[in-house]
């Protein structure tokens, strides 16, 4: 059994300074661990690249809204 207590924590230390088109984004996950220096969003692009972004920025919030809405639409 993996030791969850010692599981590695992913943190973001720098944020992208470029707005990413929502068409390029596939998913996101939030970094909320108190072990990380910054609250962050990690976007995964359609080519599986992970990008750290600042959740305080409006484009980041709008992108999360867009991706959330996609989860309620059945994939065909």
């Amino acid at each position: 059994q993996p030791d969850a207590i010692n599981a590695p924590v992913t943190c973001c230390y720098n944020f992208t300074n470029r707005k990413i088109s929502v068409q390029r984004l596939a998913s996101y996950r939030r970094i909320t661990s108190s072990k990380c220096p910054k609250e962050a969003v990690i976007f995964k692009t359609i080519v599986a690249k992970e990008i750290c972004a600042d959740p305080k920025q409006k484009w980041v919030q709008d992108s999360m809204d867009h991706l959330d809405k996609q989860t309620q639409t059945p994939k065909t």
Epitope: E39, L67, K69
Partner: nanobody
């Protein structure tokens, strides 16, 4: 971490109205999808309503659609649930939740929860 505190619950007669509030403190409120859930005695917790970060999209369970309205004020770090035409079946503890992870109405995608406020609708 986000702290959520609900208020506005109480006892009301069928057909009456209540407005629930949920005040958030801690991390950036506008970066969370916000939802209301409820749990009646001996029943499972159920989704009631959600609002996107921008406030531009709302979504409701079929049981409350047309009667309840969710809104948010990002400047005040508060989300509201206006409940009209209340029915005895609406009796439950109402919980406010902040959704950090990608998703929609699934409780598992909401990371932070308030302690709940009791709403009792008498016939």
């Amino acid at each position: 971490e986000v702290q959520l505190v609900e208020s506005g619950g109480g006892l009301v007669q069928a057909g009456g109205s209540l407005r629930l509030s949920c005040a958030a403190s801690g991390r950036t409120f506008s970066s969370y999808r916000m939802g209301w859930f409820r749990q009646a005695p001996e029943k499972e917790r159920e989704f009631v309503a959600l609002i996107t970060r921008s406030g531009g999209t709302t979504f409701y369970s079929n049981s409350v659609k047309g009667r309840f309205t969710i809104s948010r004020d990002n400047a005040k770090n508060t989300v509201y649930l206006q409940m009209n035409s209340l029915e005895p079946e609406d009796t439950a503890v109402y919980y406010c939740a902040a959704g950090a992870q990608m998703g929609w109405a699934e409780a598992s995608t909401y990371d932070y929860w308030g302690q709940g406020t009791q709403v009792t609708v008498s016939s």
